[in-house]
């Protein structure tokens, strides 16, 4: 269930301090979009798959991992242009002859239907309607993900209202 974030409108403090600790909240960083229990960042520039992977790491995140068809649909609904494509964290492992997520797990046959070749140097991207494989050297946009984290915000009590 999605956590509800309420606003406190009652102040019973007699002596207001300059700042007050707000309760723990599930927050996405600025510029990141909340989708269920994840925060997503859609890149504005383009890169090969390896550089996209590295960029997400520098942001203390990973390339997008998609758990099921529902999550795929939710993510695709955020892509507003039919032509634009985004790398995700899935590529072809030549040694294991299978699609492998960057967390080490393998693609289940029911998860995603990938259009394109399953071969060396193939990586996976999503568009508004489909999932494709492409040479990893192709330069396109990418999606980073973070798990929603507890953030303790220091805010002025007036900003609670």
């Amino acid at each position: 269930q999605k956590p509800s974030i309420g606003k406190c409108s009652v102040d019973i403090q007699q002596n207001r301090t300059k700042t007050t600790e707000r309760p723990d909240l599930l927050n996405c960083p600025i510029y990141w979009q909340q989708v269920q229990e994840k925060c997503l960042l859609f890149s504005h520039t383009v890169n090969p798959w390896n550089n996209s992977l590295a960029d997400c790491s520098t942001k203390e995140s990973s390339l997008l991992l998609i758990q099921d068809k529902d999550e795929l649909t939710r993510t695709q609904n955020l892509i507003h242009d039919k032509a634009i494509s985004f790398w995700i964290g899935l590529n072809f492992s030549l040694s294991e002859k299978n699609w492998k997520w960057i967390n080490g797990s393998f693609l289940s046959s029911n998860d995603l239907k990938i259009t394109g070749d399953a071969k060396e140097n193939s990586c996976v991207y999503i568009s508004q309607t489909s999932v494709y494989s492409e040479y990893c050297s192709t330069e396109m946009k990418w999606i980073c993900q973070k798990e929603l984290t507890l953030v303790r915000n220091k805010v002025s009590p007036d900003s609670w209202l």
Epitope: T45, V46, K82, S85, G116, E134, T138, E139, M140, K141
Partner: antibody
Framework: QVQLVESGGGLVKPGGSLRLSCAAS????????MSWIRQAPGKGLEWVSY????????AYADSVKGRFTISRDNSKNTLYLQMNSLRAEDTAVYYC???????????????WGRGTLVTVSS | DIQLTQSPSSVSASVGDRVTITCRAS??????LAWYQQKPGKAPKLLIY???GLQSGVPSRFSGSGSGTDFTLTISSLQPEDFATYYC??????????FGGGTKVEIK
């Protein structure tokens, strides 16, 4: 203003060389796949070559492979086409074209220059 | 290489007419197809991408459909400025990117 402006065309003898340039302005040049597309007088369109945003990936039509070289200078927002060993059948208007951003190598050409005419004749 | 065959090669029509141009690919290309308009002495202009996506700024009277090998460009109500030559282009991820031979839309 978002635009592409080609230059460098002209009359050249068979076996000769020319270097075409395409100056881009009004957009982030380094984010886009760029191509050269040509059109012989009174004929249809023929894709010639593309180069990826970083310049790391390049492809050519079989008809020009080994004779033409595409390159780019992202610091100067300029695309180039070095044409060697020119033939009469290379006579055409050469267009510089930008692909829609982030479609990978599925190229759709959304911005074109006005073209520059290359005439190969003795 | 993938060949694209356009038909008809030319069509005579009047303002207000509905015009349909077809493009057939020699092998399946999913939805990787674009349509362009070109007027004499001018560069081509992108109308439709990914078979049915309307390019920004293009009037809604232009529409595209199809997938696999058969594609259609429809102009629902022909306007004076629509008299031009139209080209389809396939954009499968492996070059070369081929164009159809063109369809000239002329005034009847």
């Amino acid at each position: 203003q978002v635009q592409l402006v080609e230059s460098g065309g002209g009359l050249v003898k068979p076996g000769g060389s020319l270097r075409l340039s395409c100056a881009a302005s009004g957009f982030t040049f380094s984010d886009y796949y760029m191509s050269w597309i040509r059109q012989a007088p009174g004929k249809g369109l023929e894709w010639v070559s593309y180069i990826s945003p970083s310049g790391a990936t390049i492809a050519y039509a079989d008809s020009v492979k080994g004779r033409f070289t595409i390159s780019r200078d992202n610091s100067k927002n300029t695309l180039y086409l070095q044409m060697n060993s020119l033939r009469a059948e290379d006579t055409a208007v050469y267009y510089c074209a930008r692909s829609l951003m982030a479609t990978g190598t599925h190229l759709y050409f959304d911005l074109w220059g006005r073209g520059t005419l290359v005439t190969v004749s003795s | 290489d993938i060949q694209l065959t356009q038909s008809p090669s030319s069509v005579s029509a009047s303002v207000g007419d509905r015009v349909t141009i077809t493009c057939r690919a020699s092998q399946g290309i999913s939805s990787w197809l674009a349509w362009y308009q070109q007027k004499p002495g001018k560069a081509p202009k992108l109308l439709i991408y990914a078979a049915s996506g309307l390019q920004s700024g293009v009037p809604s009277r232009f529409s595209g459909s199809g997938s696999g090998t058969d594609f259609t460009l429809t102009i629902s109500s022909l306007q004076p400025e629509d008299f031009a030559t139209y080209y389809c282009q396939q954009s499968t991820s492996f070059p070369p990117y081929t164009f159809g031979g063109g369809t000239k839309v002329e005034i009847k």
